[in-house]
């Protein structure tokens, strides 16, 4: 069991306290009420590409 704040989720995912695991942020546009989506707003998705060097 992960202790929040210790092992971060991989890029493009966020921790769900309701499921006790990392969840894919890609599902958040379809269902923004999910608890882990708050964490997705703070980090860019895996497909995010910087437009500057």
């Amino acid at each position: 069991e992960r202790v929040p704040g210790t092992t971060p989720c991989s890029r493009g995912s966020s921790w769900s306290a309701d499921l006790d695991k990392c969840m894919d942020c890609a599902s958040c546009p379809a269902r923004p009420h999910s608890d882990f989506c708050l964490g997705c707003a703070a980090a860019p998705p895996a497909s995010f590409r910087l437009l500057w060097p």
């Epitope: 069991e1 769900s16 306290a17 309701d18 499921l19 006790d20 969840m23 599902s27 379809a30 269902r31 009420h33 999910s34 608890d35 882990f36």
Partner: antibody, heavy 120, light 108 residues
Framework: EVQLLESGGGLVQPGGSLRLSCAAS????????MMWVRQAPGKGLEWVSY????????HYADSVKGRFTISRDNSKNTLYLQMNSLRAEDTAVYYC?????????????WGQGTLVTVSS | DIQMTQSPSSLSASVGDRVTITCRAS??????LNWYQQKPGKAPKLLIY???SLQSGVPSRFSGSGSGTDFTLTISSLQPEDFATYYC??????????FGQGTKVEIK
């Protein structure tokens, strides 16, 4: 075979308390979210409460918030519902159900239910 | 909370009939819609999840469709064991899971 067996129901006076249990078998209990759903006599299904696999996150319907407490003991493969300040409108069959491994998407196994009757 | 409205509330049908039950959400729920079957004195049983995915072990005569606000459960050829009450359930607006009021399928 997945089995969920509720117990602890019965007749209780208004204002009283009951503790329901749901014993799980036939699967590894600890990775699954669980929930309680109730059904008043002759009525439809009403979601009551949800608990995360570790027990660290809980949610309640507005109708029971502040009166009911959901918990689990993963070492005993058991889910609980502590019901306090019971009202006549809490009279129902209470079911425990197992959640899927994605976010609140479905509940694939249900117990047979235990009847709670609140009456003086 | 999102309201789920099923229609009809009850219907009478014969063995072999094609039966369609409708569920409407008060706002868009994408495809986060499940269907359950309940027989008298028994627990609900999951039939369809994510609007159209058939739960393992459920006969293929059951199918689900729809997205957004309008969904249907279809039984292609009603069997004697299908006489029961059917409930839809939304899992979009978590944790406020809500069910439809149910549709009772009776023998004509």
């Amino acid at each position: 075979e997945v089995q969920l067996l509720e117990s602890g129901g019965g007749l209780v006076q208004p204002g009283g308390s009951l503790r329901l249990s749901c014993a799980a078998s036939g699967f590894t209990f600890s990775p699954y979210p669980m929930m309680w759903v109730r059904q008043a006599p002759g009525k439809g299904l009403e979601w009551v409460s949800y608990i995360s696999p570790s027990g660290g996150s809980t949610h309640y319907a507005d109708s029971v918030k502040g009166r009911f407490t959901i918990s689990r003991d993963n070492s005993k493969n058991t889910l609980y519902l502590q019901m306090n300040s019971l009202r006549a409108e809490d009279t129902a069959v209470y079911y425990c159900a197992r959640g899927g491994d994605t976010y609140f998407d479905y509940f694939d196994y249900w117990g047979q239910g235990t009847l709670v009757t609140v009456s003086s | 909370d999102i309201q789920m409205t099923q229609s009809p509330s009850s219907l009478s049908a014969s063995v072999g009939d094609r039966v369609t039950i409708t569920c409407r959400a008060s706002q868009s729920i994408s495809s986060y819609l499940n269907w359950y079957q309940q027989k008298p004195g028994k627990a609900p049983k999951l039939l369809i999840y994510a609007a159209s995915s058939l739960q393992s072990g459920v006969p293929s005569r059951f199918s689900g469709s729809g997205s957004g606000t309008d969904f249907t459960l279809t039984i292609s050829s009603l069997q004697p064991e299908d006489f029961a009450t059917y409930y839809c359930q939304q899992s979009y607006s978590t944790p406020g899971i809500t069910f439809g009021q149910g549709t009772k399928v009776e023998i004509k």
